[in-house]
Amino acid sequence: PEPPTACREKQYLINSQCCSLCQPGQKLVSDCTEFTETECLPCGESEFLDTWNRETHCHQHKYCDPNLGLRVQQKGTSETDTICTCEEGWHCTSEACESCVLHRSCSPGFGVKQIATGVSDTICEPCPVGFFSNVSSAFEKCHPWTSCETKDLVVQQAGTNKTDVVCGPQDRLRA
């Protein structure tokens, strides 16, 4: 018979034949042959594989480093990775939660809408037209542009969401 060019789901093609993939939680020891099935072995302690696979090595469970403020939220199994979270009052820096911060700062162009608490991180909002923030901050709101008119000055340089307007003297020369 013609050797296969594609295999069914949960199979892989090797040496012109279809072998079964190893189930989640197991790694590949040896490929199948004409006479033998794929040989798989369970992942060891602190290891996992979360898909049907042909990996020869299991992945190490994530380490929740207490020196970075991390603790285990959910212990890993042979089929799932460990899930880390931050100590109470701290916040993950990313969805993967690889490190913790007390709170995040709002970048220039954004102001603080709500200061962080033990439960929720800083909430930032973009500075609307007429307002700016030129700093990274965890408490400062967007500041209104300086009103040149009230100082009897004129706008020399327009403001942006990151910079204040620049005021200058009125041009006294009239045509």
Partner: nanobody, 116 residues
């Protein structure tokens, strides 16, 4: 290596005053926003006060407004918290924090106990 060393805590009677200091090293202190945060026994972290990198803007939690004053001396790389009219509920370990506020910049804090 970034280091923040808090000092100035102690035992004080209700109504008394204390001045906390936070000595910073391992980074250019000037220009960094700084915070004072506290943790009362068995409680979560509470953000007490903050000061902008320029020193021109400050923030105070409602619980300390009018009683606490945050300040900085960039020439001494030091952050301060002047605490007046202290109350029993101000008892906590006080920590200073710098942007980006990561856990590994966290100091050991200084314990303030308000009791008669």
């Amino acid at each position: 290596e970034v280091q923040l060393l808090e000092s100035g805590g102690g035992l004080v009677q209700p109504g008394g005053s204390l001045r906390l200091s936070c000595a910073a090293s391992g980074f250019t202190f000037a220009g960094y926003e700084m915070w004072w945060v506290r943790q009362a026994p068995g409680k979560g972290l509470e953000r007490v006060s903050a000061i902008s990198g320029s020193g021109g803007s400050t923030y105070y939690a409602d619980s300390v407004k009018g009683r606490f004053t945050i300040s900085r001396d960039d020439s001494k790389n030091t952050l301060y918290l002047q605490m007046n009219s202290l109350r029993a509920e101000d008892t906590a370990v006080y920590y200073c924090a710098k942007e980006p506020y990561s856990y590994d910049y966290w100091g050991h804090g200084t314990l303030v106990t308000v009791s008669s």
